[in-house]
């Protein structure tokens, strides 16, 4: 808390400019008008205020807007965003994607902070669903964003948004999350032809049921082992040796290297030895 002191003569700030960086904290408090600060917030980010001086500016805005900042101020917060607590952010109503981008830019290169998580949560809830433009923006800043959501939260993602998802965005998703995302991806990509469809659906296949894997095995997709290893064990177990051979194509030889790992290990144990021998890989059931 900065003490209330009178502004020294001749130091009252007529505008927000770089001369203010040489003001002591108490001088900023006494000599900068909060309403002026709010109207000239777009200047703040270009001025090299110290982290400590930003405390004073935040204090002034908090006094001016005790119920939460208007979006006209929020979109120009810049580095001042780093001073906000999740409690501050919960008072905001952020509706513009441009505002969201501007604030995410401040945190760029760092992992998602509680402030950012709260901001995103407020923004998405305000929109009602995770639309494509929002998802595009969020995954550009945080490739792991999608996998940080619960299955319940993912259920609000419309199939149209799935087009914004890149394979790396799903790297850290667990099977429960892929169970939710896969049907949406299947719906989103349903009008694509065989090979193009497989390219798009591949990274979602950790949520695919047995019948869809059987259907893919009829399409000469040549699934790689890395994708196969991420499939649900319960979806792989019912597949026959012939179906797995068709699904993997030339990659079937990779099963030998993975024979001790799930789901390959469990699948091998379910097969007849005669059928496994047809692969010529020396797999022992």
């Amino acid at each position: 808390e900065v003490e209330k002191t009178a502004c020294p003569s001749g130091k009252k700030a007529p505008e927000i400019d770089e001369s203010l960086i040489f003001y002591k904290k108490w001088e900023l408090e006494a000599c900068v008008d909060a309403a002026l600060l709010a109207t000239q917030m777009d200047r703040v980010n270009a001025i090299p205020f110290t982290y400590e001086q930003l405390d004073v500016l935040k204090h002034k805005l908090d006094e001016l807007y005790p119920q939460g900042y208007p979006e006209s101020v929020i979109q120009h917060l810049g580095y001042l965003f780093l001073k906000m607590s999740p409690e501050d952010i919960r008072k905001w109503n952020v509706t513009s994607l441009e505002t969201l981008k501007a604030l995410l830019e401040v945190n760029k290169g760092h992992e998602m902070s509680p402030q950012v998580a709260t901001l995103i949560d407020r923004f998405v809830k305000g929109r009602g669903q995770l639309d494509k433009d929002t998802l595009d923006t969020l995954t550009a800043f945080y490739p792991g964003y999608l996998c940080s959501l619960s299955p319940e939260e993912l259920s609000s993602v419309p199939p149209s948004s799935i087009w914004a998802v890149r394979p790396q965005d799903l790297d850290t998703c667990d099977p429960r999350q892929l169970d939710v995302l896969y049907p949406k991806a299947r719906l989103a990509f349903q009008n694509m032809n065989g090979s193009e469809y497989f390219v798009k659906i591949q990274s979602f296949l950790g949520g695919a049921p047995t019948e869809d894997l059987k259907a893919l095995s009829q399409q000469n997709v040549s699934m790689d082992l890395a994708t196969f290893m991420k499939l649900r064990t319960d979806a792989v177990l019912p597949l026959t040796v012939a179906e797995v051979q068709k699904l993997l194509g030339p990659h079937v030889e990779g099963l030998k290297a993975e024979e001790r790992h799930r789901p390959v290990r469990d699948w091998i144990l379910r097969q007849r030895q005669d059928d496994l021998d047809t692969l010529g890989l020396g797999l022992q059931g």
């Epitope: 960086i21 270009a46 090299p48 110290t50 982290y51 930003l54 580095y79």
Partner: antibody, heavy 119, light 107 residues
């Protein structure tokens, strides 16, 4: 990787001026303030001032206001500091340094230029 | 201007020692303090920022502590490669100011 390259040494006569350069590479030059710091032999460091390459905006330590002038050339990603009316007190190593905003500590330092003022 | 005082210009140490270098600010600077290491003929290197955060790639034997006016850089297990000058810097207000430095030497 991020680098700030400076010439190794400058020998100048008392009363003359010298223009020191700092060539940046490995990052977007116009996105970061550039600061300059003085170090006299066996002494601590002194902050001279800073310039924003995009706007050309400058801020100086009062102590160096009449001594140093900061400029940039965006096309070559180079920052300059001109020192005028040199005396033996100006003999020092001068560093350019890139700060982390808004914390203003320096994560990248130039190689340093040794300025010797001697007749 | 805020004055950063490093009262010990020199400190004698031996390998394996626990070394504490202190820095005192002339007024409250919160946690806006950084520590740098400088070896002869080299540029300073950032070790600690915001009083206690270790910079990327800095060995964990280096730790920073303090807030307000008193700050400490501690090297928990002194190594020969740690023989250098150490400077503190405040970034609470302009002009930014540095301590005069503490030189670590072998006993």
């Amino acid at each position: 990787q991020v680098q700030l390259q400076q010439p190794g040494a400058e020998l100048v006569k008392p009363g003359a001026s010298v223009k020191l350069s700092c060539k940046a590479s490995g990052y977007t030059f116009t996105s970061y303030w550039m600061h300059w710091v003085k170090q006299r032999p066996g002494q601590g460091l002194e902050w001279i001032g800073m310039i924003h390459p995009n706007s050309g905006s400058t801020n100086y330590n009062e102590k160096f206001k009449s001594k140093a002038t900061l400029t940039v050339d965006k096309s070559s990603s180079t920052a300059y500091m001109q020192l005028s009316s040199l005396t033996s007190e100006d003999s020092a190593v001068y560093y350019c340094a890139r700060p982390v905003v808004p914390y203003w500590y320096f994560d990248v330092w130039g190689t340093g230029t040794t300025v010797t003022v001697s007749s | 201007d805020i004055v950063m005082t490093q009262s010990q210009k020199f400190m004698s140490t031996t390998v394996g020692d626990r070394v504490s270098i202190t820095c005192k600010a002339s007024q409250n600077v919160g946690t806006a303090v950084a520590w740098y290491q400088q070896k002869p003929g080299q540029s300073p290197k950032l070790l600690i920022y915001s009083a206690s955060n270790r910079y990327t790639g800095v060995p964990d034997r280096f730790t920073g502590s303090g807030s307000g006016t008193d700050f400490t850089l501690t090297i928990s297990n002194m190594q020969s490669e740690d023989l250098a000058d150490y400077f503190c810097q405040q970034s609470s207000s302009y002009p930014l100011t540095f301590g005069a430095g503490t030189k670590l030497e072998l006993k």
